[in-house]
Interface confidence: low
């Protein structure tokens, strides 16, 4: 199939964001101290507001049946055609895309329109391909598409394991959600980060915004306020705060370091889980709350984001002698975990190096060109190219391949920034083995 319907640009030009929004909104170091209760309440309210707005922004207008009539342009050198059109061979005319066959989402000088996606079997067509927007496909009822296997719809589980209770239904974008009866800990062990904002996904329209949603929102906000006050007054705050600040932002600037390798999931974790599960509105797809709690380490020492930052300080000499391996903090799939971080790379890699980097990683000219055409905007171009690389390379698309390519291009600063970012996001950690055994 040509291009996944889920990743296709929406009419608005926004493409699916995996996890949090732009980097500016989340990676910053903490500024002046503010009352702790306020931090939690504001974060919770923002979470609710953005969840609600995500529902609203997903409302699709009636599909436009025809694009604007053909338009003439003055000269080829400034010849751009509107969405729903492509430029003619001689550069003089704008030719309409064929409705239901192809499309173009931006003002462009494409010589032909992009081909519409055909939904796979097991998918339903949520909205048809128009001349200005690709088909939007969604998994059939009883199946879902998750981040780990975006190429296919998987069957939802029929029930929860023993000792667990269902708190979330099967949706086209998430499996049923189960939590432990006693603690409220999710079955997957995932802990959505409070600090993250939830952004909408063109590929996965949410259910319509309704009065009940607003009522739930207000109720949840009230509960959050009460819980926040309780937590603030309790002695557990000191244990909870590093999690809240560290899981998503990597604890940058936070003086309290949490040693994850020595910490066993226990009572403190359950308090956090309960707080977070209260904060999470049930309408928000589970998969969009992506930051995961690292599972208990098995056999190797996992370092906390805080410790990881200290690891970056030794001299270059040691760095060259021993290569430390970056591994997913949650023991998840390395390629998928890396993919979740692509959103921020546009801020870390200089624009001039985007194409050389992708060529170094093995993308061909037209793959780069198609990625550019599919991107929802300038900033999304690198993201789209990196996704193409992952789709093309599969399991071979490793964080080390990417870092090595940057090194080869002489982009050492960008390499360092990405390494730092992967660590501080809490998604990656250094693998510590016996002497050099774990080093490559």
């Amino acid at each position: 199939m040509e291009q996944r319907g889920q990743n296709a640009p929406a009419a608005s030009g926004a493409r699916k964001r995996h996890g949090p929004g732009p980097r500016e909104a989340r990676g910053a170091r903490p500024g002046p101290r503010v009352p702790k209760t306020l931090v939690l309440v504001v974060a919770a309210v923002l979470l609710l507001v953005s969840a609600e707005s995500a529902l609203i922004t997903q409302q699709d207008l009636a599909p436009q049946q025809r694009a604007a009539p053909q338009q003439k342009r003055s000269s080829p050198s400034e010849g751009l055609c509107p969405p729903g059109h492509h430029i003619s061979e001689d550069g003089r005319d704008c030719i309409s895309c064929k409705y239901g066959q192809d499309y173009s989402t931006h003002w462009n000088d494409l010589l032909f329109c992009l081909r519409c996606t055909r939904c796979d079997s097991g998918e339903v067509e949520l909205s048809p391909c128009t001349t200005t927007r690709n088909t939007v496909c969604q998994c059939e009822e009883g199946t879902f598409r998750e981040e780990d296997s975006p190429e296919m719809c998987r069957k939802c589980r029929t029930g929860c394991p023993r000792g667990m209770v269902k708190v979330g239904d099967c949706t086209p974008w998430s499996d049923i959600e189960c939590v432990h009866k006693e603690s409220g800990t999710k079955h997957s062990g995932e802990v959505p980060a409070v600090e993250e904002t939830v952004t909408s996904s063109p590929g996965t329209p949410a259910s319509p915004c309704s009065l009940s949603g607003i009522i739930i929102g207000v109720t949840v906000a009230a509960v959050v306020l009460i819980v926040a006050v309780f937590v603030c007054k309790s002695l557990l705050w000191k244990k909870v705060l590093p999690y809240l600040k560290g899981i998503c932002s990597g604890g940058g600037g936070d003086p309290e370091r949490v040693d994850r390798s020595s910490q066993r999931p226990g009572a403190e974790d359950n308090v956090l889980n309960e707080i977070v599960s209260i904060l999470q509105p049930t309408q928000v797809p589970e998969q969009e709350m992506e930051v995961q709690e690292p599972a208990e380490p098995t056999g190797v020492n996992m370092l906390s984001p805080g410790e990881s930052e200290h690891l970056l300080e030794p001299a270059e000499a040691e760095r060259s002698q021993r290569r430390r391996l970056l591994v997913p903090a949650n023991e998840g799939d390395p390629t998928e975990t890396l993919r979740q971080c692509f959103d921020d790379f546009a801020d870390l890699v200089p624009f001039d190096s985007w194409e050389p980097l992708m060529r170094k990683l093995g993308l061909m000219d037209n793959e780069i060109k198609v990625a550019k055409a599919e991107a929802a905007g300038h900033r999304d171009t690198l993201y789209t190219m990196l996704i193409k690389w992952v789709n093309k390379t599969g399991r071979d698309a490793s964080v080390h391949t990417l870092l090595d390519a940057l090194e080869t291009l002489g982009e050492r600063l960008a390499k360092q920034k990405i390494e730092d970012h992967l660590l501080s996001s809490g998604k990656f950690m250094y693998l510590e083995g016996n002497a050099d055994s774990a080093m490559s």
Partner: antibody, heavy 129, light 107 residues
């Protein structure tokens, strides 16, 4: 009218160098990617190299990589092919050709399709001792 | 590199005949395929680009189809001026490659 005129061909000994030129007229040269394509006597077409509208990217066929250099002077509307370490198998008619995609400086992207819509008449290069 | 296999390498046909030339690629190239016509002693001429997009000034008897690895150039009713050599060319990735050519001769 739109025209490409190659020059610089001739007979040259193996190991020697030669520089081909291609003068463009009738269109905005710096808006187009440009190619060199060659054809050995009695054989088919072989793509040699391409240069982007602004000279920022250059690609070569494996058979000429490291020996040939494509370049352009947009102020002179001229495309060049510097051929070093010439071999007998480089004997061919060399054509310059325009890429059919227009670069638009008001567009956020440059779409590169590599279809060659305007060709020169060709210049013959013979490598023989 | 992407290999291009054109068939047949030559064919004899009469005026008015329907002629079909095929081009197969060693890997999928989506629709990034162009067709050229070349007459003896002349430069090639672009007929069709992006598999099926007819160049301006090219008669409508020429048509192209296909996607992925298999492509076809069809001349619905052969005319005297159509006797020439036809080349396919992939534009998916560099190095760009041409097919070996198909020579269309008068029967």
């Amino acid at each position: 009218q739109v025209q490409l005129v190659e020059s610089g061909g001739g007979v040259v000994q193996p190991g020697r160098s030669l520089r081909l030129s291609c003068a463009a007229s009738g269109f905005t040269f710096n808006n187009y990617g440009m190619h060199w394509v060659r054809q050995a006597p009695g054989k088919g077409l072989e793509w040699v190299a391409v240069i982007w509208y602004d000279g920022s990217n250059k690609y070569y066929a494996d058979s000429v990589k490291g020996r040939f250099t494509i370049s352009r002077d947009n102020s002179k509307n001229t495309l060049y092919l510097q051929m070093n370490s010439l071999r007998a198998e480089d004997t061919a008619v060399y054509y310059c050709a325009r890429d059919r995609t227009v670069y638009s400086n008001s567009s956020p992207f440059y779409y590169y399709y590599y279809g060659m819509d305007v060709w020169g008449q060709g210049t013959t290069v013979t490598v023989s001792s | 590199d992407i290999q291009m296999t054109q068939s047949p390498s030559s064919l004899s046909a009469s005026v008015g005949d329907r002629v079909t030339i095929t081009c197969r690629t060693s890997q999928s190239i989506s629709t990034y395929l162009n067709w050229y016509q070349q007459k003896p002693g002349k430069a090639p001429k672009l007929l069709i680009s992006a598999t099926s997009s007819l160049q301006s000034g090219v008669p409508s008897r020429f048509s192209g189809s296909g996607s992925g690895t298999d492509f076809t150039l069809t001349i619905s009713s052969l005319q005297p001026e159509d006797f020439a050599t036809y080349y396919c060319q992939q534009s998916y990735s560099t190095p760009l490659t041409f097919g070996g050519g198909t020579k269309v001769e008068i029967k």
